[in-house]
Interface confidence: medium
């Protein structure tokens, strides 16, 4: 057996997709310039990236949102990178907030999240936002991925 078979590259990069559901969990799709290296990582429910190998992973997300309300009356836009472990406990891995700094009809802002985390087989990661209706889904705006180190 070749070394590459024992330690295959595991990588995923998926693109945001608008959803009619009211859930705060962002929806993703294998479309455009996406990556899904092999079946050791899967996009499940259009919402979560699930890995089948234990190890250290770099996990990242970029969320672009439309700041389209008066800054004085608007709560901050918060994006969270969350982990759902096999025991079904959910936890927040990373979180970031941006104030709405533009009074224009749509002042584009973005949040970037990224970090290295140990994942167990069957662990899933997903992205939560406070207001999914403000997320921008155009090409290159909002994406999510991971890479096994």
């Amino acid at each position: 057996m070749q070394k590459g078979d024992q330690n295959p590259q595991i990588a995923a990069h998926v693109i945001s997709e608008a959803s009619s559901k009211t859930t705060s969990v962002l929806q993703w799709a294998e479309k455009g310039y996406y990556t899904m290296s092999n079946n050791l990582v899967t996009l499940e429910n259009g919402k979560q990236l699930t890995v089948k190998r234990q190890g250290l992973y770099y996990i990242y997300a970029q969320v672009t949102f439309c700041s389209n309300r008066e800054a004085s009356s608007q709560a901050p836009f918060i994006a969270s990178l969350c982990l759902k472990s096999p025991g079904r406990f959910e936890r927040i891995l990373l979180r970031a907030a941006n104030e709405h700094s533009s009074a224009k009809p749509c002042g584009q802002q973005y949040i970037k999240l990224g970090g290295v985390f140990e994942l167990q087989p069957g662990a899933s990661v997903f992205v939560n936002v406070t207001d999914p209706s403000q997320v921008s889904h155009g090409t290159g705006f909002t994406s999510f991925g991971l890479l096994k180190l």
Epitope: T23, V25, E44, T50, G122
Partner: nanobody
Framework: EVQLLESGGGLVQPGGSLRLSCAAS????????MMWVRQAPGKGLEWVSS????????YYADSVKGRFTISRDNSKNTLYLQMNSLRAEDTAVYYC?????????WGHGTLVTVSS
């Protein structure tokens, strides 16, 4: 249109077995993690078990671990729950669902009654 249709419930004596089925349609079943939840009379919803999209990972609540087995047949778009060594406290309406939905695509459930 998304539809989930549970079946297989019924009256069974303590220590008995049942196999629940959930027929799914209207979405790409093989890409979705699925779960079983239950609601006992007068109580809230309780998560029972989950299974990954390809069936390689299964998770169970402590209350059913070792007695219940979740499985799926993606070629038939069907989710299963094999329930053994049933107890009175397993009496409930059982629902299959996709973990992220907010009750919009839930079926009507199937009633399991464990009684002597």
């Amino acid at each position: 249109e998304v539809q989930l249709l549970e079946s297989g419930g019924g009256l069974v004596q303590p220590g008995g077995s049942l196999r629940l089925s959930c027929a799914a349609s209207g979405f790409t079943f093989k890409k979705y993690e699925m779960m079983w939840v239950r609601q006992a009379p007068g109580k809230g919803l309780e998560w029972v078990s989950s299974i990954s999209s390809d069936g390689s990972f299964t998770y169970y609540a402590d209350s059913v671990k070792g007695r219940f087995t979740i499985s799926r047949d993606n070629s038939k778009n069907t989710l299963y729950l094999q329930m053994n060594s049933l107890r009175a406290e397993d009496t409930a309406v059982y629902y299959c669902a996709e973990p992220f939905t907010e009750f919009d695509y839930w079926g009507h459930g199937t009633l399991v009654t464990v009684s002597s």
